[in-house]
Amino acid sequence: RRDVAHGILNEAYRKVLDQLSAGKHLQSLVARGVGGSLGGGAGDDAEPLSKRHSDGIFTDSYSRYRKQMAVKKYLAAVLGKRYKQRVKNKGRR
């Protein structure tokens, strides 16, 4: 019975470690991108409270990832003329 309990605890512990590892991996990937160099605008203030008060690591990572994606779309549109990737493409031009 003790072995079973240990097995359950070990499994739960491993899952927690996996989640933390995944979070750190996401954070490292995002940190290589925008990494806070670019400031967010109105979009940051508009985030729901639940998101704003959730786990700091993941909120920060998500915010950075969002900025990274926004900048990528901007660069594609203004320097690459990739209109498909525009924020709102209404088919003009």
Epitope: A76, V87, K88, N89, R92
Partner: antibody, heavy 107, light 109 residues
Framework: VEESGGRLVTPGTPLTLTCTVS????????MTWVRQAPGKGLEWVGF?????SAYYATWAKGRFTISKASTTVDLKITSPTTEDTATYFC??????WGPGTLVTVSS | AAVLTQTPSPVSAAVGGTVSISCKSS???????LAWFQQKPGQPPKQLIY???TLASGVPSRFKGSGSGTQFTLTISGVQCDDAATYYC??????????FGGGTEVVVK
């Protein structure tokens, strides 16, 4: 695309520049601010996207605020220093530029 | 921060000749999203090239952009008097947005 609001200001006095567009749907385009100090090169300040979110160059964050309405895009220089003396350009997608507006910061 | 280094100014070119302007980036340009601009005194910049090598609408075919990664070049063939201007490259970076090169003045003789 036309910029306005440039003038002589003393250091620390907030200044708002306005970019007025006609025939352009701001909900479909990125609007960018670029500046150029007298006799110097171009310097990217930041942009505002279709949804109204603004993004800034690392050096510009906290020093500038970009916002927009239906036919205007504003650039606020929160606390100008002499280093902010420049011609400020507003551009749609970097392919349609205004003539620029000159800001002089001096005591 | 990303730095774009251009051919030092000024660059001289004879009418009908060819001139090449180099633009070297301190780090890889995202998606090769690099543009070239022409600016004349008292005027705003005019986009000549986007996506490193695509000619912007209405720009004469004597302008040609090439390169990828960290090294890009603007070549003007059959130079005309009207080409006298300062040329800027502008590269895209996910970590820094847009960075402009320092500019290269082309003098036509």
């Amino acid at each position: 695309v036309e910029e306005s609001g440039g003038r002589l200001v003393t250091p620390g006095t907030p200044l708002t520049l306005t970019c007025t567009v006609s025939g352009i749907d701001l909900s479909s385009y990125y609007m960018t601010w670029v500046r150029q100090a007298p006799g110097k090169g171009l310097e990217w300040v930041g942009f505002i996207d279709a949804g109204g979110s603004a993004y800034y160059a690392t050096w510009a964050k906290g020093r500038f605020t970009i916002s927009k309405a239906s036919t205007t895009v504003d650039l606020k220089i929160t606390s100008p220093t002499t280093e902010d003396t420049a011609t400020y350009f507003c551009a749609r997608d970097l392919d349609l530029w205004g003539p620029g507006t000159l800001v002089t910061v001096s005591s | 921060a990303a730095v774009l280094t251009q051919t030092p100014s000024p660059v001289s070119a004879a009418v009908g000749g060819t001139v090449s302007i180099s633009c070297k980036s301190s780090e890889s340009v995202y998606g090769d999203y690099l543009a070239w601009f022409q600016q004349k005194p008292g005027q705003p910049p005019k986009q000549l090239i986007y996506d490193a090598s695509t000619l912007a609408s209405g720009v004469p075919s004597r302008f040609k952009g090439s390169g990828s990664g960290t090294q890009f070049t603007l070549t003007i063939s059959g130079v005309q008097c009207d080409d006298a201007a300062t040329y800027y490259c502008a590269g895209g970076y996910v970590s820094a947005g847009v960075a402009f090169g320092g500019g290269t003045e082309v003098v036509v003789k």
